[in-house]
Interface confidence: medium
């Protein structure tokens, strides 16, 4: 070896100065008597050094790098040869920083594996090889006084966490523990912990499970929910607080917390509950009365809410068959009494014989709101409720009896817009207590089976707004009947549209006669249409050659018309426009053309 | 001198209920663990609970979970166990114990006989 | 929860014999086993915890060994006031169950 390098430090701080020195040794035979020494750091020459010989021949060479900013590098003695960069020696040079202090220190109790785990935050980048260590020691009380040491746990190279299996931790006394971070500029100690490993326990949740229902148990009340969770077994021994969240899997509801509840329940019911609505529930326990971290939440359980009975009123109407008055078509709404008024699943119409005790026929049942069914000699009266698997709502009579009341007045209709019809009427005195309106198509479309109906309440309503079923260009019947305490008054009817529709299309014009001066044209009305409201006039248009145009207004009932005034031998444009208070509709244009003064009239 | 003195004991019906009490003294109870044993007639030692120093953990033996609670008062020295429900077979010599930092069963109390017969 | 079985259930020596009792865990339980020795109408008292720790006061002949699921409990010279009951406990988790015991009898 020619050269050898010699450096004040191969470590150092990022940014501090460094000093080298190489030799070269006189017996490098091959060499320049006064050899040139140069410096390479990495791949760059580096000026500045300090070139001497020595009294026993050896040539040195001293150079100081006022600031080390590379975090590695490799610093070269060499000389030239011939044409070429020869190096006598190298080192390598690194740089960084000292550790800074481990924080955020934590650890957590596994059960399962009865180990300690800890984790920590190493701080930034030193930039050189840095080696952590969790330190920890056997203690009484705070930790303050040192007992035994417990064996390091290194953890695995680039990872912040470390595992004290069970041999080595202390579950009936405290421990401290600290991470000691240590590399060749400095060691660094993280703030230490006391803890009694199960003061960090990490529970995990109880597994929630619904109640297997028992025969002589009774069944939950509406609203409510049976359930009951099993503690995890490895922390049974520990005192534990636990609470439940709830939500209704539908809609966006957020979590509502119920709680605190005791680690185990052999029952619980859980209640204030929607009805007939599916719930998720999942429940967590945390160490309690001493601190502790919160379990995961369990894993979901999925129950549904027993249901309540409907809570509904039945607003219901009836109607005979004319040809069979024993037959009647019953019809029925149910009207919310309250917000949550219970899932209907069907209707049942019942009737109860006078003089059999108990004995209630049915009639029918349905999940449709309406029935038809033959009505018994001597039924004047039967009972309509709404079901579910609950119960039932509050059984609704329904009489049938003459219509003895007096009859309403001045009915009458008009659109309001193309969706909506407005049915006004005088009350009639006394005043009924409500309005039956039904509603549907007119002829010839009519249909019993397919009619609306409303139920109005106040007997002093002069109106009603039709919105449900209302289409335009369609001819509606609608049929106002006043109620009374026990019986009702005779129906009244009316027929409007809610919007009509204009001519579809206008008659086709035909010519008749012509002459020089005039010609007669006639045509075949269109028939009139369901939902098209009646033509009011009719205008017949005709051009001639230099586009000038003329016009007659005719009455709705004309048949044909007579041009007069024309040009012999000129050529007309002519056109029929049908309209009615819906709008109007041209015909398609006519184009004929005048006899010559010579010719003779055409009949 | 450590110090452990049970009592509480006696004859009680099956069903019934008793409370033992340990009074302590001779070393600080409040930093260690503590723990009940008993011994049926002409039987093995029987490990029942024991309760951490600050008493947040409390594991019991399933012939006893349930029906027995551990409990502690750092303020008067005194460790107690709770049991309800007593049947034939916890007749025994109950044991009061101090517990070490391993876990061992340091030091113990005389025992105190309780007998559960109709 | 560990289960802990003691050999034998009772043994007959002399005085001056050497005797060995053992007690094998159900699963491994590192070195967190204890001996105690019990005399007719006495509470217990410990004598090695932690495996082969001896406690204060206790005389060098008993000693103990073993970790994991295997351990012994070793008296080497047999003395009058040894005749006793010895049981094993484990306190690696916090259900302590103890063996069954072994009865040393005089032969």
């Known amino acids: 070896e020619c050269g050898h390098i010699s450096v004040s430090a191969p470590i150092v701080h990022l940014g501090d100065p460094i000093t080298a020195s190489c030799i070269i040794k006189q017996n490098c035979s091959h060499l320049d008597p006064e050899p040139q020494i140069l410096w390479r750091l990495g791949a760059e020459l580096q000026p500045g050094g300090r070139q001497q010989r020595l009294s026993d021949g050896t040539q040195e060479s001293i150079i100081t790098l006022p600031h080390l900013n590379h975090t590695q590098a490799f610093l070269s003695c060499c000389l030239n040869w011939g044409n070429s960069l020869q190096i006598l020696d190298q080192v390598e040079l690194r740089a960084g920083y000292p550790p800074a202090i481990p924080h955020n220190l934590s650890c957590l109790m596994n059960l399962t594996t009865s180990s300690l785990i800890c984790q920590w935050e190493p701080g930034p980048e030193t930039h050189l090889p840095t080696s952590f260590t969790l330190k920890s020691f056997k203690s009484r009380g705070n930790c303050q006084t040192q007992g035994d040491s417990i064996l390091d746990c290194v953890p695995k190279d680039g990872q912040s966490h470390c595992c004290i299996p069970r041999k080595h931790l202390l579950l009936y006394q405290n421990m401290g523990i600290w991470v000691q971070a240590e590399n060749a500029l400095g060691t660094s100690m993280s703030p230490q912990l006391c803890l009694d490993p199960m003061d960090v326990v990490k529970l995990e949740p109880p597994m929630l499970r619904t109640m297997d229902p028992s025969p002589e148990a009774a069944p939950p009340q509406a609203g409510c929910l049976q359930l009951c969770w099993e503690p995890w077994q490895p922390g049974l021994h520990i005192n534990q607080k636990c609470e439940l969240r709830h939500k209704p899997q539908r809609g966006e509801a957020s979590w509502a917390l119920v709680g605190p509840l005791p680690l185990e329940a052999l029952q619980y019911e859980l209640c204030g509950l929607l009805p007939a609505t599916a719930y998720t529930l999942q429940i967590r326990c945390i160490r309690w009365p001493l601190p502790g971290h919160w379990s995961d939440w369990s894993p979901s359980l999925e129950l549904r809410t027993t249901e309540r009975a409907p809570t509904v009123r039945l607003d219901t109407w009836w109607r005979q068959r004319q040809l069979d008055p024993r037959t009647v078509q019953l019809f029925w709404k149910p009207v919310p009494l309250e917000e949550d008024s219970g899932r209907i699943q069907g209707y049942v119409v019942s009737w109860r014989p006078s003089g059999q005790a108990g004995a209630i026929l049915p009639l029918c049942n349905t999940t449709e709101l309406s029935c038809t069914f033959h009505l018994p000699s001597e039924a004047q009266e039967v009972a309509l409720v709404a079901y579910n698997s609950a119960g039932t709502s509050r059984p609704t009579p329904v009489v049938f009896s003459e219509s003895r009341g007096p009859a309403l007045t001045r009915l009458h209709a008009m659109a309001r817009d193309p969706h909506s019809l407005w049915v006004g009427w005088e009350p009639p005195n006394p005043w009924p207590q409500g309005y039956v309106i039904e509603w549907g198509l007119g002829p010839p479309s009519a249909s019993n089976s397919n009619k609306t109906w409303r139920m109005e309440q106040n007997g002093r309503a002069t109106g009603f707004l039709l919105k449900e079923n209302i289409r335009p260009f369609q001819l509606y019947e609608i049929i106002v009947t006043p109620l009374y305490q026990d019986t009702m008054g005779p129906s009244q009817h009316v027929y409007a549209y809610s919007q009509e529709m204009a001519p579809s299309h206008a008659p086709e014009l035909h010519l008749k006669h012509i002459g020089k001066t005039w010609a007669q044209l006639e045509w075949v009305p269109e028939p009139p249409e369901l939902g098209k409201s009646p033509l009011t006039h009719y205008t017949i248009f005709w051009t001639n050659a230099q586009n000038q145009s003329f016009s007659a207004i005719l009455n709705a009932s004309s048949r044909g018309f007579v041009l007069h005034g024309l040009e012999p031998a000129s050529l007309y444009h002519i056109h029929l426009m049908a309209a009615s208070q819906a709008g109007a509709t041209n015909s398609t244009v006519l184009t004929l053309m005048t006899l010559t003064p010579e010719g003779s009239e055409l009949h | 001198e450590v110090q452990l003195l049970e009592s509480g004991g006696g004859l009680v019906q099956p069903g019934g209920s008793l409370r033992l009490s340990c009074a302590a003294s001779g070393f600080t109870f409040s930093l260690y663990w503590m723990g009940w044993v008993r011994q049926a007639p002409g039987k093995g030692l029987e490990w029942v609970s024991s309760i951490s120093s600050s008493g947040g953990v409390t594991p019991y033996a399933d012939s006893v979970k349930g029906r027995f609670t551990i409990s502690r008062d750092n303020s008067k020295n005194t460790l107690y166990l709770q049991m309800n429900s007593l049947r034939a077979e916890d007749t025994a010599v109950y044991y009061c114990a101090k517990l070490g930092e391993l876990g061992q069963y340091q030091f113990w109390g005389q025992g105190t006989l309780v007998t559960v017969s109709s | 929860d560990i289960q802990m079985t003691q050999s034998p259930s009772s043994l007959s020596a002399s005085v001056g014999d050497r005797v060995t009792i053992t007690c094998r865990a159900s699963?491994?339980?590192?070195?967190?086993l204890n001996w105690y020795q019990q005399k007719p109408g006495k509470a217990p008292k410990l004598l090695i915890y932690y495996a082969s720790n001896l406690q204060n006061g206790v005389p060098s002949r008993f000693s103990g060994s073993g970790s994991g699921t295997d351990f012994t409990l070793t008296i080497s010279s047999l003395q009058p006031e040894d005749f006793a009951t010895y049981y094993c406990q484990q306190s690696f988790q916090y259900a302590q169950h103890f063996g069954g015991g072994t009865k040393v009898e005089i032969k």
């Open positions: 699963q491994g339980i590192s070195s967190y």
